[in-house]
Interface confidence: low
C-alpha cells in the first residue's frame, strides 16, 4: 500500500494534548520507535501524568482518503456498550509548509488530529524540494514553532561583516529561487537551504536533513549539511555545515536578523534571536485579547468589533471584502457562513465566499508583529481553504475614533492579506528596538548614539543662529525618549527631541518610526510632538551623515519652519556609517562597501616612537612598526616605561594589520608582557584612529587600560576616508 503523504514519511511527528498532559508520537508511514507501544504502532500516546504508554493507532490497520487518515487498533473501548475499537483520526488540510499535527480532541474511542500541510494540497505550488519538521515540544510540553519563519520564496540574508560573501538561509526548508525576484539567489543550487554567494557564484553549503531540536530551554537548533559528496575548494577539505541557533529573547523586543557568529572551515554558526523560538502559549490566543508576561505585552482588540449589522469594508479591485474582528460579519449576503472575512465579487454579488471564519481565529504577537489570522474559509481550486491574514500596525492617530480601517494589500494562493492601522494595536513604546537601517547588505546601527540613563547625558544640538538672550536648548536622544535630567528635567516624558527656553519646554517629536536610509544618509523622523496650531503637531527630521570615527560630535540645527511645526537637524557621526569590518595588510585598509580606503603608513616612524606621557608612565608607540627606543623591546609596537624606576613592559608585538569597522580604524598589538594574574594574560594595545581633516599626522592619546588592553585614541587626517 503506497504511503498517502510521502513528504511526511521521513519523520516521527509529535502532538500534544496540553489539558491532559499527553504527548502523542505519530509516524504515518511506518511505526514509531517506542518499545512500550509495540512494534507496529503508528500513533503512540504517552500519558505523562500516569507515566503510561498506549498505542492508539496501528500502522497495519491504516485506511486513507485524500484528506483523512485513520489508524485502528485491536483494543476495545467502552463507549456506551458498543464494540468500538480505539482509533486515531487525522484530518488533512492544505497548508503552505509541512506544518504540524495538532491535537483537536479525544473521546473514549477516538483521538482526533488536524494537520495543515503542503502534503495535502491538490497542486504542488507550496511543496518544497526538501523540508523538515519545524517545531519542537519542550519538557513541559510547550510548543516552539518556527513554521511562521519559513519563507515560501526568497531567503534571509545572514548578517556578516564580510562584504565579499553573502550567506542566505531559509528555515527548515530549501530556498525557492524560482519564485524569488532577487537575482542573487537565482544561482543557488536547487535543494539548498543555505546558499553562499561569493561574487557571482552560489554554493550549496547546507540542506535540511533533520528536524528542529531543542538543546535547552528556549534555545532551538537547526542543522544543515551539504548532501553533495564533492568538497568546496574554499573549505580547506572540510564539508560545509550550517548550524542555526534560535534564541528566545529574555524580554520583548523586535526580532533581530540572523547573525553569523563563526565561519571557519565552512562551519557556519548562526544565532537568531526571535520570539518564534519562545514557547507559543505566550504568543498566541484564540480570542481577541492576548497577554504575555515574558513579552511584556497586553493587547485587546475587542473595541474593534462591529455590531448592529455593520462591517468594515475593504476594496480589493475585483472583490469587496467585508470584515469584522472578534465576531461574525453581519452582512445579509454573508449570513449563515459564519465568516469573519467575507469575499464578494463586485460584478456578481451572488458569488460570496468565506475567506476565514470567526471561530477559526488565531491572534499572534511575535517579533513586534501583531497578526490576526482567520482560517477555515471556503475551499478554492487548489484544495486550500481560504484564509485571511490581518497585520496590525500601531497608529495612535488612526481615524475612525482610533479604530482605523483594514486595507486589502493582496492575495497569494487563496490567502488574503490586509493591513490595519489602529491605536488598539499599540504595544508599549518600542524603545531600543528599531535603531538601525538596512540597504541591501549594508547595515547601519545608530544604537551607539542612544543615551539610556544617568550618568549619560542627552545630546544637545548646536544652534549658531541664536543670541544668548533668546537661547533655546535642543535636547535630543536617538531611538529613545530624552533623559529628564539637567536642563531637560522638565521635558515631556515621551519626547525624543525637546526644546527648552526661558518659557519652558516643548516636545518636538516622539520616536515612533525607525530610521530609514535615504539619499546616502540615514533619516530619523520624530513625529507627534506638541500641538503647533491648526490641528498640527510638531515634527522633527534628523539627517545623520556618515563621519567615520566621530561618535562625539553633536547634532546641528539646520532649519525650523512651518510656524514652529517642523525642525531639521543634521548630525555628522560614525553611527551613520555602514557597518562593515574590513582587515588590511601593510598598514592599509580598504572598505569596499563604504568605498573608503585608508593608508596609515605615513604615520610609521622609521626610527624612534611617539611618546605619550601620563603621571606615572611614559608610553612609546609606533604605527605598523616596532618602537626603536631604549629600553623598549625591539619587536614591540607599544611599550610602557615606569617613570619611577624605568621598569619596562612590552604592550604587544608590532604588526601592520589594520581593521576598519563602523567608521573607525583600529590597530591591535598582542602578545606583550604577561600580567601577574592567574592566567598570565599577555598585555595588548588597541589604537583607534579617528578622522580629523585638520590634524595632519596628529598624535596618540592614552585612554584607559581595559581587559589587558591599552587603548589609545589618535585623531589624524590619515584616518579620513578618500574615495579609491
Amino acid at each position: 500500500q503506497a504511503a498517502p503523504f510521502p513528504e511526511l514519511c521521513s519523520y516521527t511527528w509529535e502532538a500534544v494534548d496540553t489539558k491532559n498532559n499527553v504527548l502523542y508520537k505519530i509516524n504515518i508511514c511506518g511505526s514509531v520507535d517506542i518499545v512500550q507501544c509495540g512494534p507496529s504502532s503508528a500513533v503512540c500516546m504517552h500519558d505523562l501524568k500516569t507515566r503510561t504508554y498506549h498505542s492508539v493507532g496501528d500502522s497495519v490497520l491504516r485506511s486513507a482518503t485524500r484528506s483523512l487518515l485513520e489508524f485502528n487498533t485491536t483494543v476495545s473501548c467502552d463507549q456506551q456498550g458498543t464494540n468500538h475499537r480505539v482509533q486515531s483520526s487525522i484530518a488533512f488540510l492544505c497548508g503552505k509548509t509541512l506544518g504540524t499535527p495538532e491535537f483537536v480532541t479525544a473521546t473514549e474511542c477516538v483521538h482526533y488530529f488536524e494537520w495543515r500541510t503542503t502534503a495535502a494540497c491538490k497542486k504542488d505550488i507550496f511543496k518544497a524540494n526538501k523540508e523538515v519538521p519545524c517545531y519542537v515540544f519542550d519538557e513541559e510540553l510547550r510548543k516552539h514553532d518556527l513554521n511562521p519563519l519559513i519563507k515560501l520564496s526568497g531567503a534571509y540574508l545572514v548578517d556578516d561583516s564580510d562584504p565579499d560573501t553573502s550567506l542566505f538561509i531559509n528555515v527548515c526548508r530549501d530556498i525557492d529561487t524560482l519564485r524569488d525576484p532577487g537575482s542573487q539567489l537565482r544561482a543557488c543550487p536547487p535543494g539548498t537551504a543555505a546558499c553562499l554567494v561569493r561574487g557571482h557564484q552560489a554554493f550549496d553549503v547546507g540542506q535540511p536533513r533533520d528536524g528542529l531540536k531543542l538543546v535547552r530551554k528556549d534555545r532551538l537548533v537547526l542543522s544543515y549539511v551539504r548532501e553533495e559528496a564533492g568538497k568546496l575548494d574554499f573549505c580547506d577539505g572540510h564539508s560545509p555545515a550550517v548550524t542555526i541557533t534560535f534564541v528566545c529573547p529574555s524580554e520583548r523586543r523586535e526580532g533581530t536578523i540572523p547573525k553569523l557568529t563563526a565561519k571557519s572551515n565552512c562551519r557556519y554558526e548562526i544565532e537568531w534571536i526571535t520570539e518564534y523560538a519562545c514557547h507559543r502559549d505566550y504568543l498566541e490566543s484564540k480570542t481577541c485579547s492576548l497577554s504575555g508576561e515574558q513579552q511584556d505585552v497586553s493587547i485587546d482588540l475587542t473595541p474593534l468589533a462591529q455590531s448592529g449589522g455593520s462591517s468594515y469594508i475593504s476594496d480589493g479591485k475585483e472583490y469587496l471584502f467585508y470584515l469584522n474582528v472578534c465576531g461574525e460579519t453581519e452582512i445579509q449576503f454573508c449570513n449563515k457562513k459564519q465568516a469573519a472575512v467575507c469575499q464578494v465579487k463586485k460584478s456578481d454579488t451572488s458569488q460570496v465566499k468565506a475567506a476565514g471564519r470567526y471561530h477559526n481565529q488565531t491572534l499572534r504577537y511575535s517579533d513586534g508583529d501583531l497578526t490576526l489570522i482567520y482560517f477555515g474559509g471556503d475551499e478554492c481550486s487548489s484544495g486550500f481553504q481560504r484564509m485571511s491574514v490581518i497585520n496590525f500596525e500601531c497608529n495612535k492617530t488612526a481615524g475612525n475614533d482610533g479604530k482605523g480601517t483594514p486595507v486589502f494589500t493582496g492575495e497569494v494562493d487563496c490567502t488574503y492579506f490586509f493591513t490595519w492601522d489602529t491605536e488598539y494595536a499599540c504595544v508599549k513604546e518600542k524603545e531600543d528596538l528599531l535603531c538601525g537601517a538596512t540597504d541591501g547588505k549594508k547595515r547601519y546601527d545608530l544604537s551607539a548614539l542612544v543615551r539610556h540613563a544617568e550618568p549619560e547625558q542627552n545630546w544637545e544640538a548646536v544652534d549658531g543662529s541664536q543670541t544668548e538672550t533668546e537661547k533655546k536648548h535642543f535636547f535630543i536622544n536617538i531611538c529613545h525618549r530624552v533623559l529628564q535630567e539637567g536642563k531637560a528635567r522638565g521635558c515631556p516624558e515621551d519626547a525624543a527631541v525637546c526644546a527648552v527656553d526661558k518659557n519652558g519646554s516643548k516636545n518636538l517629536g516622539k520616536f515612533i518610526s525607525s530610521p530609514m536610509k535615504e539619499k546616502g544618509n540615514i533619516q530619523l523622523s520624530y513625529s507627534d510632538g506638541d500641538d503647533c496650531g491648526h490641528g498640527k503637531k510638531i515634527k522633527t527630521n534628523i539627517t545623520l551623515v556618515c563621519k567615520p570615527g566621530d561618535l562625539e560630535s553633536a547634532p546641528v540645527l539646520r532649519t525650523s519652519g512651518e510656524g514652529g511645526c517642523f525642525y531639521e537637524f543634521e548630525w555628522h557621526t560614525a553611527a551613520a556609517c555602514v557597518l562593515s569590518k574590513t582587515e588590511g595588510e601593510n598598514c592599509t585598509v580598504f572598505d569596499s562597501q563604504a568605498g573608503f580606503s585608508f593608508d596609515l603608513s605615513p604615520l610609521t616612524k622609521k626610527n624612534g616612537a611617539y611618546k605619550v606621557e601620563t603621571k606615572k608612565y611614559d608610553f612609546y608607540i609606533n604605527v605598523c612598526g616596532p618602537v626603536s627606543v631604549s629600553p623598549c623591546q625591539p619587536d614591540s609596537g607599544a611599550c610602557q616605561v615606569a617613570k619611577s624606576d624605568e621598569k619596562t613592559w612590552n604592550l604587544g608585538l608590532s604588526n601592520a594589520k589594520l581593521s576598519y569597522y563602523d567608521g573607525m580604524i583600529q590597530l591591535n598589538y598582542r602578545g606583550g608582557t604577561p600580567y601577574n594574574n592567574e592566567r598570565h594574560t599577555p598585555r595588548a594595545t588597541l589604537i583607534t584612529f579617528l578622522c580629523d581633516r585638520d590634524a595632519g599626522v596628529g598624535f596618540p592619546e592614552y585612554q584607559e587600560e581595559d581587559n589587558s588592553t591599552y587603548n589609545f585614541r589618535w585623531y589624524t587626517s590619515y584616518a579620513c576616508p578618500e574615495e579609491p
Partner: antibody, heavy 117, light 106 residues
Framework: QVQLQQPGAELVKPGASVKLSCKAS????????MHWVKQRPGQGLEWIGM????????NYNEKFKSKATLTVDKSSSTAYMQLSSLTSEDSAVYYC??????????WGQGTTLTVSS | ENVLTQSPAIMSASLGEKVTMSCRAS?????MYWYQQKSDASPKLWIY???NLAPGVPARFSGSGSGNSYSLTISSMEGEDAATYYC?????????FGGGTKLEIK
C-alpha cells in the same frame, strides 16, 4: 570528472554570425556560472561574460554586449555563445570556463575562430 | 574598468633562480588570481585568493599582495615553469586580466 568540450575550429566569413558551443559533463550543469573568455593570437585574455544555466541570468563585459549573446540548453548541458557581425578583429581562440569554488577552475580546450573571406 | 598592468612583459631566468613578477591594479581589489598558460594550451588556474596554490601547483610558487599591488614568486625556477602568467581580478565586473608576463629560460 568535470569536462568542458569545445569544437576545435570554426571558419566564418566577415559579416556573418557564428554560434560556439561548450558541452559540460561531470557535474550538475545548473549549479555553476559558465564564463567565456577571448584570446587573440599572441595576445592576452579578455573576459566576455557569463551565464547561469539555472535561471539564464547573464552578465556581460560592456565591450562585448553588442557582439556576444550567451545562451544555454539545460537538457543537453551545453552553453552557447553567438558572435554577430564578424570582422577580422573577432578572429581569436574562445574559451568557456567554469568556476571550481573560485573563478575559472576548469577551462575548455578553446575554439579557434577564423574570420576570413 | 579595472586595468591590470603586469610587469615585466617578458623575462628570462636561469634554472634555480628566484623569479618575481608583479601585477598592479588601477583600482584596489580584494583578491588576485593567477593563471599559467603554455603555448597552444588552455590557461590553468595557478593561484587563487591571492596566495592559495591551485591543486597540483608546486610549492615553489607563492603569491602575495593586497590593495593595488600583487606579485607571483617562484623560489627556484625550473624548466617546466617557462610559460605565460596572467593575473586576473574578480572584484568588479568586467573581470579583467593583465597583459601577461612571459617567463623564459635563460
Amino acid at each position: 570528472q568535470v569536462q568542458l568540450q569545445q569544437p576545435g575550429a570554426e571558419l566564418v566569413k566577415p559579416g556573418a554570425s557564428v554560434k560556439l558551443s561548450c558541452k559540460a559533463s561531470g557535474y550538475t550543469f545548473t549549479n555553476y556560472w559558465m564564463h567565456w573568455v577571448k584570446q587573440r593570437p599572441g595576445q592576452g585574455l579578455e573576459w566576455i561574460g557569463m551565464i547561469h544555466p539555472n535561471s539564464g541570468s547573464t552578465n556581460y563585459n560592456e565591450k562585448f554586449k553588442s557582439k556576444a549573446t550567451l545562451t544555454v540548453d539545460k537538457s543537453s548541458s551545453t552553453a552557447y555563445m553567438q558572435l554577430s557581425s564578424l570582422t577580422s578583429e573577432d578572429s581569436a581562440v574562445y574559451y568557456c570556463a567554469r568556476p571550481h569554488g573560485y573563478p575559472f577552475g576548469y577551462w575548455g580546450q578553446g575554439t579557434t575562430l577564423t574570420v576570413s573571406s | 574598468e579595472n586595468v591590470l598592468t603586469q610587469s615585466p612583459a617578458i623575462m628570462s631566468a636561469s634554472l634555480g633562480e628566484k623569479v618575481t613578477m608583479s601585477c598592479r591594479a588601477s583600482s584596489s581589489v580584494n583578491y588576485m588570481y593567477w593563471y599559467q598558460q603554455k603555448s597552444d594550451a588552455s590557461p590553468k588556474l595557478w593561484i587563487y585568493y591571492t596566495s592559495n596554490l591551485a591543486p597540483g601547483v608546486p610549492a615553489r610558487f607563492s603569491g602575495s599582495g593586497s590593495g593595488n599591488s600583487y606579485s607571483l614568486t617562484i623560489s627556484s625556477m625550473e624548466g617546466e615553469d617557462a610559460a605565460t602568467y596572467y593575473c586576473q581580478q574578480f572584484t568588479s565586473s568586467p573581470y579583467t586580466f593583465g597583459g601577461g608576463t612571459k617567463l623564459e629560460i635563460k
